[in-house]
Amino acid sequence: QQQTLPKPFIWAEPHFMVPKEKQVTICCQGNYGAVEYQLHFEGSLFAVDRPKPPERINKVQFYIPDMNSRMAGQYSCIYRVGELWSEPSNLLDLVVTEMYDTPTLSVHPGPEVISGEKVTFYCRLDTATSMFLLLKEGRSSHVQRGYGKVQAEFPLGPVTTAHRGTYRCFGSYNNHAWSFPSEPVKLLVTGDIENTSLAPEDPTFPADTWGTYLLTTETGLQKDHALWDHTAQNLLR
């Protein structure tokens, strides 16, 4: 006899990185017929939702109108069908951004390189932080962690055309409180084709969409959205 239901998916809309004082919605997708959803924050019960009618709803939303550092942390959700509870979802790392200062991102040897060149990103922030995060925009939402007193180096090694795209960095005051984003740096990697700067592989966005940290323009299946969010969050951990 089944003791638990499959775990639900959890994700944040528009994104798990939320500028302070902005709104965010935590979504939890379980099964049709679930009579109760519980959202847990840092291991404690945070909110409860009872969908009506349960047989027509398989997703609930928990709205946070005003993001701040107290709301940043690890969230998970569970749901119940009858008396049977689900496994807990994966952990959602909700990050508050636009805290304090703006780092400077630069790239060596320059923003236009040839496939095979050794490329290093430098993220610098003069205020009290020792952890830095480098993010590549796009559906796969790559995140790298680096350390240093005022600057972190992110060596990409010899690059390929898969590295092309737009990068930003953050200073991290703790795992869930990040600085403003740096200005973007677009890395153009030319392959073996004569004088061709290839366009980014991952879909990227008009610059203004980064303002709300939308790393994808398409929601697609909610499951997909959740999965790529988890990819980034797991890298953070």
Partner: antibody, heavy 117, light 107 residues
Framework: QVQLVQSGAEVKKPGASVKVSCKAS????????MHWVKQAPGQGLEWIGE????????NYNEKFKRRATMTVDKSISTAYMELSRLRSDDTAVYYC??????????WGQGTLVTVSS | DIQMTQSPSSLSASVGDRVTITCRAS??????LNWFQQKPGKAPKLLIY???RLHSGVPSRFSGSGSGTDYTFTISSLQPEDIATYFC?????????FGGGTKLEIK
């Protein structure tokens, strides 16, 4: 268009210091590393080092590390290279250069530094 | 540091001649090899980057080839305005290093 305009020729005594400037225009100054290259009379080219105008980061050729200092003033898009404790073999033309695409594709006109007692 | 050995150090040729200059690196530079032209009293000018790619605006009579440690620069048909000194430069590892130069003269 991209331009790197360097300061004028200098005559210095041994032991003195010289500071060469390179005023950049026509591109985003803070995005591209500024390189400095030495060319002694009738000789080849020697890379002194590079500076990242965006954050002040530097890479030096070991040979010049103790006596060369590269700095920038972002507010006026100008890079500087100071050479201290000058000797006669520092007599050379000093160039600033940037790599806008895949190699050092823009160069200043050069600054002749003569070290003579 | 990677040593770049360029040969010959000087070369005399006639207009229309095919001219070849070689550059040998002390270790593999993975094709990150550039060629510069310098005329008297002027700054160096980039001609070829990444072994064989022509910089914008450079005439097609200039070409480059090679791999590993051995590289070649060729002028297919020498023109009077090509009289200059030519330098190779490796960009694979810091510090970038230059060859000693080849001074090209007209016969």
């Amino acid at each position: 268009q991209v331009q790197l305009v360097q300061s004028g020729a200098e005559v210095k005594k041994p032991g003195a210091s010289v500071k060469v400037s390179c005023k950049a225009s026509g591109y985003t100054f803070t995005t591209y590393w500024m390189h400095w290259v030495k060319q002694a009379p009738g000789q080849g080219l020697e890379w002194i080092g590079e500076i990242n105008p965006g954050n002040g980061g530097t890479n030096y050729n070991e040979k010049f590390k103790r006596r060369a200092t590269m700095t920038v003033d972002k507010s006026i898009s100008t890079a500087y290279m100071e050479l201290s404790r000058l000797r006669s073999d520092d007599t050379a033309v000093y160039y600033c250069a940037i790599r806008l695409r895949f190699a050092l594709d823009y160069w200043g006109q050069g600054t002749l530094v003569t070290v003579s007692s | 540091d990677i040593q770049m050995t360029q040969s010959p150090s000087s070369l005399s040729a006639s207009v229309g001649d095919r001219v070849t200059i070689t550059c040998r690196a002390s270790q593999d530079v993975r094709n990150f090899l550039n060629w510069f032209q310098q005329k008297p009293g002027k700054a160096p000018k980039l001609l070829i980057y990444f072994t064989s790619r022509l910089h914008s605006g450079v005439p097609s009579r200039f070409s480059g080839s090679g791999s590993g440690t051995d590289y070649t620069f060729t002028i297919s048909s020498l023109q009077p305005e090509d009289i200059a000194t030519y330098f190779c430069q490796q960009g694979n590892t810091l510090p970038p290093t230059f060859g000693g130069g080849t001074k090209l003269e007209i016969k």
